[in-house]
């Protein structure tokens, strides 16, 4: 039978082994944790001529001087942007991005590596990599960036037309979108026979103005003009009653890669406009 001393001895040995194992595990996790950090991006779209955001977040580091952010783009041999030791390091920046990029320097410390891209060009489309190095380790994530033009449509009653007509206009789209009319009353109806859509090239020879006219409009109905390309989908609604006209517009960026659809409602203002006294709608 084992003596009390032996039991104590083996108990202590067991405790030491368990503790050593636990410490080894902790150290192991600590070391492996320093090798890889989580970096997250969201696929997005840029509107030509405007400023865009390439979204990227990472596990923050307590020391700004230990954080390195590098943005790369497929097919581009210089860096899109580099931020290190608390400031921009642009000696390796590619010519095509010169003077057009910035990180949110005050937000880097909290894990925001998003890139602001000024004056978005059609050629900015492509695959980007957000590459992060911190004292914890390194990580990266790719981002698909689409570029085009998209704008809010406005639907108005066409007072100049000879018949009961609605006019849907959107100033800037690219690539050429499809335009579909729909109505609340005649759901599922095909309005292609009673509508006419034209695309007018804008002065910069890339984007186009979209104009679509819908004929044979009836009163007390809500009509929707839906403009869509592979980047965005915009809808302009108009409700015409005997006493007023209500309008609503909505633009949604189509973002198949992201788990959450980037959807923004602009100009959700209902404009109350008196009907023209001479406009007689059926």
């Amino acid at each position: 039978m084992a003596s009390l001393g032996q039991i104590l001895f083996w108990s202590i040995i067991s405790i030491i082994i368990i503790l050593a194992g636990a410490i080894a595990l902790i150290i192991g996790f600590g070391i492996s944790g320093r090798h890889s950090i989580t970096v997250t991006t969201v696929a997005s779209a840029g509107n030509i001529g405007e400023d865009g955001i390439l979204s990227c977040t990472f596990e923050p580091d307590i020391k700004l001087s230990d954080i390195v952010i590098q943005w790369l783009k497929e097919g581009v041999l210089g860096l899109v942007h580099e931020f290190k030791e608390g400031k921009d390091e642009l000696s390796e920046q590619d010519e095509m991005f010169r003077g057009r990029t910035a990180v949110f320097a005050d937000q880097v410390i909290v894990g925001n590596a998003s890139l602001r891209l000024k004056n978005v060009q059609l050629t900015d489309a492509g695959t980007y990599k957000c590459y992060i190095i911190t004292s914890k380790g390194k990580g990266n994530a790719n981002l698909e960036y689409k570029t085009g033009a998209f704008s809010m449509p406005e639907v108005n009653v066409d007072y100049n037309a000879s018949s009961e007509t609605l006019r849907c206009e959107a100033p800037r789209w690219f690539p050429q979108p499809t335009v579909v009319w729909a109505s609340q009353v005649d759901q599922g109806a095909n309005f292609s026979e009673v509508s006419n859509t034209s695309f007018e090239l804008n002065s910069e020879n890339v984007t186009m103005k979209v104009v679509s006219v819908l004929y044979n409009v009836t009163i007390n109905n809500t009509y929707s003009c839906m403009i869509e390309n592979d980047i965005a989908k915009a809808t302009g609604d108009i409700k015409v009653t005997e006493s007023e006209i209500k309008r609503r517009s909505h633009l949604q960026l189509l973002n198949s890669k992201a788990s959450l659809c980037v959807s923004s409602f602009f100009a959700i203002s209902w404009a109350l406009l008196p009907l023209s006294p001479y406009l007689m709608l059926k």
Epitope: K73, E74, G75, V76, L77, G78, D94, E95, T127, K129
Partner: antibody, heavy 121, light 107 residues
Framework: EVQLLESGGGLVQPGGSLRLSCAAS????????MNWVRQAPGKGLAWVSA????????YYADSVKGRFTISRDDSKNTLYLQMNSLRAEDTAVYYC??????????????WGQGTTVTVSS | DIQMTQSPSTLSASVGDRVTITCRAS??????LAWYQQKPGKAPKLLIY???SLESGVPSRFSGSGSGTEFTLTISSLQPDDFATYYC?????????FGQGTKVEIK
């Protein structure tokens, strides 16, 4: 299958010209930057020239600057290297290679089989 | 220009040996370092990129490590198919630089 196929090599006299071609297939050629790399007989690899995916930016090793011109025709999925004022030291096997910036950090993941250029009188 | 120096130039080893090739950069590089394998009369083949990432289809006996100026390629257990010349390559400022190569031959 991702493939690069060089052609246009041959024997040329010093001071002469040659145009190498590299036909790409199996990937979206216009997306990627491309390189020419050469290997002199019994020697190591040496980078010659690079072109961006858009074709708007070109880069050269000092040894070929002003003599060689890299270009691409995305409609034909073809990369070119126009070599003028050739010298004996330009004798080498010339490889074209696809540069993967995003996935492989400027590594060259696809190479052609090479075409031999011999500059001799 | 950044110079890349490989050592040794030639390495004699046997099947099953653990082999290490070193590559030194003349100045610190971002980790944009790749390793290639080349067999006589063939095109180079990418093995490792970003200093330590294994290219898909490359056997796991190949591994890369290092940062700053010193990098290593390790073959944990040399196989008959591994006798070849190995090159390190760095990228910086629109220029690629290769090491002079390390020939791994049968002892």
């Amino acid at each position: 299958e991702v493939q690069l196929l060089e052609s246009g090599g041959g024997l040329v006299q010093p001071g002469g010209s040659l145009r190498l071609s590299c036909a790409a297939s199996g990937f979206t050629f216009s997306t990627y930057a491309m390189n020419w790399v050469r290997q002199a007989p019994g020697k190591g690899l040496a980078w010659v020239s690079a072109i961006s995916g858009s074709g708007g930016s070109t880069y050269y090793a000092d040894s070929v600057k002003g003599r060689f011109t890299i270009s691409r025709d995305d409609s034909k999925n073809t990369l070119y290297l126009q070599m003028n004022s050739l010298r004996a030291e330009d004798t080498a096997v010339y490889y074209c290679a696809k540069v993967d910036v995003v996935a492989r950090y400027y590594g060259m993941d696809v190479w052609g089989q090479g075409t031999t250029v011999t500059v001799s009188s | 220009d950044i110079q890349m120096t490989q050592s040794p130039s030639t390495l004699s080893a046997s099947v099953g040996d653990r082999v290490t090739i070193t590559c030194r950069a003349s100045q610190s590089i971002s980790g944009w370092l790749a390793w290639y394998q080349q067999k006589p009369g063939k095109a180079p083949k990418l093995l490792i990129y970003e200093a330590s990432s294994l290219e898909s289809g490359v056997p796991s006996r190949f591994s890369g490590s290092g940062s700053g100026t010193e990098f290593t390629l390790t073959i944990s257990s040399l196989q008959p198919d591994d006798f070849a010349t190995y090159y390190c390559q760095q990228y910086k400022s629109y220029s690629w630089t290769f090491g002079q190569g390390t020939k791994v031959e049968i002892k």
